[in-house]
């Protein structure tokens, strides 16, 4: 089976790499525009230059193209704790990231939020905090992991998953409760 190609891909595949087919005349291959520029006018004929113009401030193209407009620069989302790592240039989009001792949590492919790395209080660091992953903690005896924090087993209720880790303490609490009944 032949894979289905979009119209643009079909048109481009007729021309050699770095060129695209003229939209009004499919016998002409025009040179694509360099990154940092966009297509202002198609080349008038074979071997003639494509009219490419530099992207205006606030816009970019990151690869060779025949786009009629540059792409708008991304803005870092302050409400998500994001900070600007590098500003937008004509050939590169803004790069957003997190502050030191924070990690990115991706809610979706193109949306991340910055959170503080866990310190593993009442536990030890099993895996250090990374750019896209929180610290992995191992809790000391008498503590269990809840929302990546080591919480005292005295906060473990029988209905929760912590009962296996906190079994001796749970039995203790149960015994105390039983002895208090009449």
């Amino acid at each position: 089976l032949v894979p289905h190609l979009g119209d643009r891909e079909k048109r481009d595949s007729v021309c050699p790499q770095g060129k695209y087919i003229h939209p009004q005349n499919n016998s002409i291959c025009c040179t694509k525009c360099h990154k940092g520029t966009y297509l202002y006018n198609d080349c008038p004929g074979p071997g003639q230059d494509t009219d490419c113009r530099e992207c205006e401030s606030g816009s970019f193209t990151a690869s060779e193209n025949h786009l009629r407009h540059c792409l708008s620069c991304s803005k870092c989302r302050k409400e998500m704790g994001q900070v600007e790592i590098s500003s937008c240039t004509v050939d590169r989009d803004t790069v957003c990231g997190c502050r030191k001792n924070q990690y990115r949590h991706y809610w979706s492919e193109n949306l991340f939020q910055c959170f503080n790395c866990s310190l593993c209080l009442n536990g030890t660091v099993h895996l250090s905090c990374q750019e896209k992953q929180n610290t992995v903690c191992t809790c000391h005896a008498g503590f269990f992991l809840r929302e990546n924090e080591c919480v005292s087993c005295s906060n473990c209720k029988k209905s929760l998953e912590c009962t296996k880790l906190c079994l001796p303490q749970i039995e203790n609490v149960k015994g105390t409760e039983d002895s208090g009944t009449t």
Epitope: R77, K78, E79, M80, W107, E147, N148
Partner: nanobody
Framework: EVQLMESGGGLIQPGGSLRLSCAAS????????MVWVRQAPGKGLEWVSH????????YYADSVKGRFTISRDNSKNTLYLQMNSLRAEDTAVYYC????????????RGQGTLVTVSS
């Protein structure tokens, strides 16, 4: 105590519109970025949209961009989601929530309102 109460869901035909509301109490609503998330049957939570404290910065998932509009009225402590051109794939329970602060989980979210898009 933080309370979030969604309303406005229901059965709607494809192409139709609905407006969801979320009444907030127990915290300073005007100080919080607010979020709409949804959960389709048998699926995980999907981030739909969010709006910053003053209603200036908004975000929309690609799947709803151009069809849904998030807004808020800080004087009424209410968050809204205007849903137009509804599709079968928008069928889900919609929840409003405060933007998480401590980690990637929702400490405060409502009980949800069911939106069913079907002919």
């Amino acid at each position: 105590e933080v309370q979030l109460m969604e309303s406005g869901g229901g059965l709607i035909q494809p192409g139709g519109s609905l407006r969801l509301s979320c009444a907030a109490s127990g915290f300073t609503f005007a100080h919080e970025t607010m979020v709409w998330v949804r959960q389709a049957p048998g699926k995980g939570l999907e981030w739909v949209s969010h709006i910053d404290r003053v209603g200036q910065d908004t975000y929309y998932a690609d799947s709803v961009k151009g069809r849904f509009t998030i807004s808020r009225d800080n004087s009424k402590n209410t968050l809204y989601l205007q849903m137009n051109s509804l599709r079968a794939e928008d069928t889900a329970v919609y929840y409003c929530a405060e933007l998480p602060k401590r980690g990637p989980w929702f400490d405060h979210r409502g009980q949800g309102t069911l939106v069913t898009v079907s002919s």
